[in-house]
C-alpha cells in the first residue's frame, strides 16, 4: 500500500472512529433495563453518562439530567473524563492529521514536517482510542458487578421498599452505546496505527543522498544543478551542493529525519 493511501485510510478510519466516540459519549443507552427473567414492566429504563431516561408503554419518554457532580459515582465520573479526554485528543489528532496529509499542500511544508505531524496525529488517535476502550470497559465492568449484586437481592424483602412485599428489582445490562464505544475506540486505534505506519514511509533515510555528478570540462568539481524537493512539489532548491566523495549518484528523495515535533 502506498504511503498516501495508508495515511489517507488511517485518517478516514480514525475519523469514523472519532465520530463513533462522540456518538457513544452522547448516547443515552449506556445501560438498559434487563428484561430477561423479569416481570415485564410497562416502563423501560435506560441510562447514559449524562442523563437517565424512562420510556413508557404509552410511548412517552422522559429524560432527566444528572444535575449533580458530587452525588455521582466516582466510576461514572472517571468514565466521563476518559471519554472527554478521548474526544479532545481526537479533535487535536484530526487537526494535526489534516495538515499532515500528503495529498494536501500547505505552504512550503516538507515531508519531514509531514512525517512528524503524521506520527503525532497517529499517537493522538491511538491514545484517544485507548481512552474510549478503557472508559467503555470500566462502565461495562461496573454494570456486570451491579448486575450480579442486584441478582443476589432480586426478590429480597428488603428490595428498596422494606417489609415483605415483593418489589421489582431493576437490573441493568449493556446498552448500545457500549458496543458503539468499543467499535469506535478500536477504529480510532487502528486508524492511529495506520498513521504511524504511514509516518515511516514518509521518513527519509539521510544516509542516502543520491545525485548525479556532472564533470565540467577542464574542472574537477562536481555540481548538482538545482534539485527539487522531490515529494512536496513546492519550489526548487537551487543551491549548488558539492558532491560527496562517493562517485556519481542519482537524487531521489532528499529529506532529513525529523528531530523533534516542531508542528504548531
Amino acid at each position: 500500500m502506498s504511503v498516501t493511501a495508508c495515511q489517507g485510510l488511517g485518517f478516514v478510519v480514525s475519523l469514523i472512529g472519532f465520530a463513533g466516540i462522540i456518538a457513544a459519549t452522547c448516547m443515552d443507552q449506556w445501560s438498559t433495563q434487563d428484561l430477561y427473567n423479569n416481570p415485564v414492566t410497562a416502563v423501560f429504563n435506560y441510562q447514559g453518562l449524562w442523563r437517565s431516561c424512562v420510556r413508557e408503554s404509552s410511548g412517552f419518554t422522559e429524560c432527566r439530567g444528572y444535575f449533580t457532580l458530587l452525588g455521582l459515582p466516582a466510576m461514572l465520573q472517571a468514565v466521563r473524563a476518559l471519554m472527554i479526554v478521548g474526544i479532545v485528543l481526537g479533535v487535536i489528532g484530526i487537526l494535526v492529521s489534516i495538515f499532515a496529509l500528503k495529498c494536501i499542500r500547505i505552504g512550503s511544508m516538507d515531508d519531514s514536517a509531514k512525517a512528524k505531524m503524521t506520527l503525532t496525529s497517529g499517537i493522538l488517535f491511538i491514545i484517544s482510542g485507548i481512552c474510549a476502550i478503557i472508559g467503555v470497559s470500566v462502565f461495562a465492568n461496573m454494570l456486570v458487578t451491579n448486575f450480579w449484586m442486584s441478582t443476589a437481592n432480586m426478590y429480597s424483602g428488603m428490595g428498596g421498599m422494606g417489609g415483605m412485599v415483593q418489589t421489582v428489582q431493576t437490573r441493568y445490562t449493556f446498552g448500545a452505546a457500549l458496543f458503539v464505544g468499543w467499535v469506535a475506540g478500536g477504529l480510532t486505534l487502528i486508524g492511529g496505527v495506520m498513521m504511524c505506519i504511514a509516518c515511516r514511509g514518509l521518513t527519509p533515510d539521510d544516509s542516502n543522498f543520491k545525485a548525479v555528478s556532472y564533470h565540467a570540462s577542464g574542472q574537477n568539481v562536481a555540481y548538482r544543478p538545482g534539485g527539487f524537493k522531490a515529494s512536496t512539489g513546492f519550489g526548487s532548491n537551487t543551491r549548488n551542493k558539492k558532491i560527496y566523495d562517493g562517485g556519481a549518484r542519482t537524487e531521489d528523495d532528499e529529506q532529513s529525519h525529523p528531530t523533534k515535533y516542531d508542528y504548531v
Epitope: Q33, V40, A42, S57, T167, V168, T170
Partner: antibody, heavy 118, light 113 residues
Framework: EVQLQQSGPELVKPGASVKMSCKAS????????MNWVKQKPGQGLEWIGY????????KYNERFKGKATLTSDKSSSTAFMEVSSLTSEDSAVYYC???????????WGQGTSVTVSS | DIVMTQSPSSLTVTVREKVTLSCKSS????????????LTWYQQKPGQPPKLLIY???TRESGVPDRFTGSGSGTDFTLTISSVQAEDLAVYYC?????????FGAGTKLELK
C-alpha cells in the same frame, strides 16, 4: 377536541364473534397507543390489552389471549377489537381508551355494549 | 398478576366532608428509573366511561379540581377529596400501570348520606 367514537351495541349468539370499532379524531392516531377495557354489568374494570397503531404492536392480558384480537387501520384512524367464541361471560361494555403519559388512559370512548344471548 | 385492594368498598359521606380512599398493591409500583409510582386513579359515574383524575400516583390531570389529591408510594396509595361535592358521587378505581397486565382495584363507591 380529542374524541373516541365507538360502534353501536351488539346482540350476538353464543359461539359467534363480534368486531367493534373505535374511531379516533382530534389527534394524530399513530402517536398514541389504544387500550381496550372490559366492564361487566355492575362490576369493575378489566384491562384487555393495547395496540400501537404506529407499528401494529400489541400487548394482551393473558386472560384475553385467543379471545380478543386487536387491529387498527391508520387510513381511517380506527382501532378494532374482535371478540370470538362468545359466551355469557363476554356480555359486557367494552371501552377503548387512549394511553397517555404515566401510562394513564386519558380519553375514553363511550363504550360498546355486547350482549350474548341465544 | 398484581392485586389491587381498595378500601372501603363503599363510603357514605356528606357534602363538604373530607374523604380518604385507600389503595394497596401486592407489589411495589415505584419505578427506580424516575422515582415515579405508576398508579392511576379514575372516577366513574353511572352510565359513563371512567374519567382520569390522577396519574403517577400524585399528578393531577388537567381540568381536575384541586380538591382531588393523590399521594403514597410503593404499595400504599390514597386519594383524598378535601371537600366532597355532590358531583363527586361516583365509583373510584385505582389502577396498576407498572407491571403487565394492568390491573384495576374493585373500586370504592362514594354515596351521599
Amino acid at each position: 377536541e380529542v374524541q373516541l367514537q365507538q360502534s353501536g351495541p351488539e346482540l350476538v349468539k353464543p359461539g359467534a364473534s363480534v368486531k367493534m370499532s373505535c374511531k379516533a379524531s382530534g389527534y394524530t392516531f399513530t402517536n398514541y397507543v389504544m387500550n381496550w377495557v372490559k366492564q361487566k354489568p355492575g362490576q369493575g374494570l378489566e384491562w384487555i390489552g393495547y395496540i400501537n397503531p404506529y407499528n401494529d404492536g400489541t400487548k394482551y392480558n393473558e386472560r384475553f389471549k385467543g379471545k380478543a384480537t386487536l387491529t387498527s387501520d391508520k387510513s381511517s384512524s380506527t382501532a378494532f377489537m374482535e371478540v370470538s367464541s362468545l359466551t355469557s361471560e363476554d356480555s359486557a361494555v367494552y371501552y377503548c381508551a387512549r394511553l397517555y403519559r404515566g401510562n394513564a388512559m386519558d380519553y375514553w370512548g363511550q363504550g360498546t355494549s355486547v350482549t350474548v344471548s341465544s | 398478576d398484581i392485586v389491587m385492594t381498595q378500601s372501603p368498598s363503599s363510603l357514605t359521606v356528606t357534602v363538604r366532608e373530607k374523604v380518604t380512599l385507600s389503595c394497596k398493591s401486592s407489589q411495589s409500583l415505584l419505578n427506580s428509573g424516575n422515582q415515579k409510582n405508576y398508579l392511576t386513579w379514575y372516577q366513574q359515574k353511572p352510565g359513563q366511561p371512567p374519567k382520569l383524575l390522577i396519574y403517577w400516583a400524585s399528578t393531577r390531570e388537567s381540568g381536575v379540581p384541586d380538591r382531588f389529591t393523590g399521594s403514597g408510594s410503593g404499595t400504599d396509595f390514597t386519594l383524598t377529596i378535601s371537600s366532597v361535592q355532590a358531583e363527586d358521587l361516583a365509583v373510584y378505581y385505582c389502577q396498576n400501570v407498572y407491571i403487565y397486565p394492568f390491573t384495576f382495584g374493585a373500586g370504592t363507591k362514594l354515596e351521599l348520606k
